[in-house]
């Protein structure tokens, strides 16, 4: 039963859809629809979201927000960003962590988890890209140490240790004569 | 052909309730907007409540927000007005109508009317 | 709210006349006026909508004409179906109101 176009009010384009029975303005981000409007291109009676909700686009038919998430403490998650009116709670890792995709094709609204990132001077290695993304990436290791094994080992200290191939390379200046 | 039958007035003393009932068909029940009017002791007509077609949005004049209701039952074709706190100034015949849109989110038009039912409020 | 006046609460006229009901407006309703005719046993029925557009059904001895705030209903030769109350009503913003009602009789 819809008529034909009014020659006044005209419910094309981004400003006005038809809310009932009248082409009504739409409510801002962070606020929804208590009432449509009551005369055409008329404003709604919109409403702020209340806490701990969010709407983060202009709406025309939202009648309650959306719940903020709570970041998951068990998958070690922190807020970064707090829920506001207009936007979600931006949940994340706490610095020395690093996001871990619980999906293969990982996006940006994947569920995850954080784990902590690689001390790369604790296991005696140069830094070779920071942990942010993903875990850190170790390099080489450090000066006095070398490559034995998975690890790095310290340089021996006296004449007493043995000194295989690789540290003789990296440890030269302390071989026995 | 479009029929519209009112049933549910009474007599009912300031302060009561009364649920008004509109059955309704030969037309779309769901896709169509329908009204309640009322006509007063001095033959006067009043818009009194409203529901959209499709979305079911309701709208009501000040008069009687707050104390009236309508709703609509797809399933039974039946179109209702619950009224609570009823006053005196309420007493009159009430009408259901279906709104014809003229023009899109724009004008309407009441086009099919019933026969009304009476409500009197009175001690 | 919009106010709707018809001035004239009642009419009488001899079968075969031309009869003219008129409405007035608060504001300019933009031709969004509707007439209903009410029958002596309560029966109403949308006569015309849009100011000038007949509802099917309805003889052509009915018109309505207007603008801004002013319409008016026309009957071109009364007839003794024609015995009834007739209504404007505007039907665009809220809350939609009516006319007092023109009570039209046989002289």
């Known amino acids: 039963q819809g008529g034909t176009r009014s020659p006044r009010c005209d419910c094309a384009g981004d400003f006005h859809k038809k809310i009932g029975l009248f082409c009504c303005r739409g409510c801002p981000a962070g606020h929804y629809l208590k009432a449509p409007c009551t005369e055409p291109c008329g404003n709604s009676t919109c409403l702020v979201c209340p806490q701990d909700t969010f709407l983060a686009w202009e709406n025309h038919h939202n009648s309650e927000c959306a719940r903020c998430q709570a970041c998951d403490e068990q998958a070690s998650q922190v807020a970064l960003e707090n829920c506001s009116a207009v936007a979600d709670t931006r949940c994340g890792c706490k610095p020395g962590w690093f996001v871990e995709c619980q999906v293969s094709q990982c996006v940006s609204s994947s569920p995850f988890y954080c784990q902590p990132c690689l001390d790369c001077g604790a296991l005696h290695r140069h830094t070779r890209l920071l942990c942010s993304r993903r875990d850190t990436d170790c390099g080489t290791c450090l000066p006095g140490f070398y490559e034995h094994g998975d690890g790095c080992v310290s340089c021996p200290t006296s004449t007493l240790g043995s000194c295989p191939e690789r540290c003789a390379a990296v440890c030269g200046w302390r071989q026995m004569f | 052909e479009v029929q519209l039958v009112e049933s549910g007035g009474d007599l009912v003393m300031p302060g009561g309730s009364l649920k008004l009932s509109c059955a309704a068909s030969g037309f779309i029940f769901s896709s169509y907007g329908l009204s309640w009017i009322r006509q007063t002791p001095d033959k006067r007509l009043e818009w009194v409540a409203t529901i959209s077609g499709g979305d079911s949005y309701t709208y009501y004049p000040d008069s009687v927000k707050g104390r009236f209701t309508i709703s609509s039952d797809n399933a039974k074709n039946t179109l209702y007005l619950q009224m609570t706190s009823l006053k005196s100034e309420d007493t009159a015949m009430y009408y259901c109508?279906?709104?014809?849109?003229?023009?899109?989110?724009?004008?309407?038009?009441?086009?099919?009317w019933g026969q009304g039912t009476s409500v009197t409020v009175s001690s | 709210d919009i106010q709707m006046t018809q001035t004239t609460s009642s009419l009488s006229a001899s079968l075969g006349d031309r009869v003219t009901i008129s409405c007035r407006a608060s504001?300019?309703?933009?031709?969004?006026l509707n007439w209903y005719q009410q029958k002596p046993d309560g029966t109403v029925k949308l006569l015309i909508y849009?100011?000038?557009r007949l509802q099917s059904g309805v003889p052509s001895r009915f018109s309505g004409s207007g603008s801004g705030t002013d319409y008016s209903l026309t009957i071109s030769s009364l007839e003794q179906d024609d015995i009834a109350t007739y209504f404007c009503?505007?039907?665009?913003?809220?809350?939609?109101?009516f006319g007092g009602g023109t009570k039209l009789e046989i002289k």
């Open positions: 009503q505007q039907g665009s913003p809220l809350p939609w109101t």
């Open positions: 109508a279906t709104q014809r849109e003229i023009y899109y989110g724009t004008y309407y038009a009441l086009d099919h």
């Open positions: 504001q300019d309703i933009n031709n969004y």
């Open positions: 849009y100011t000038s």
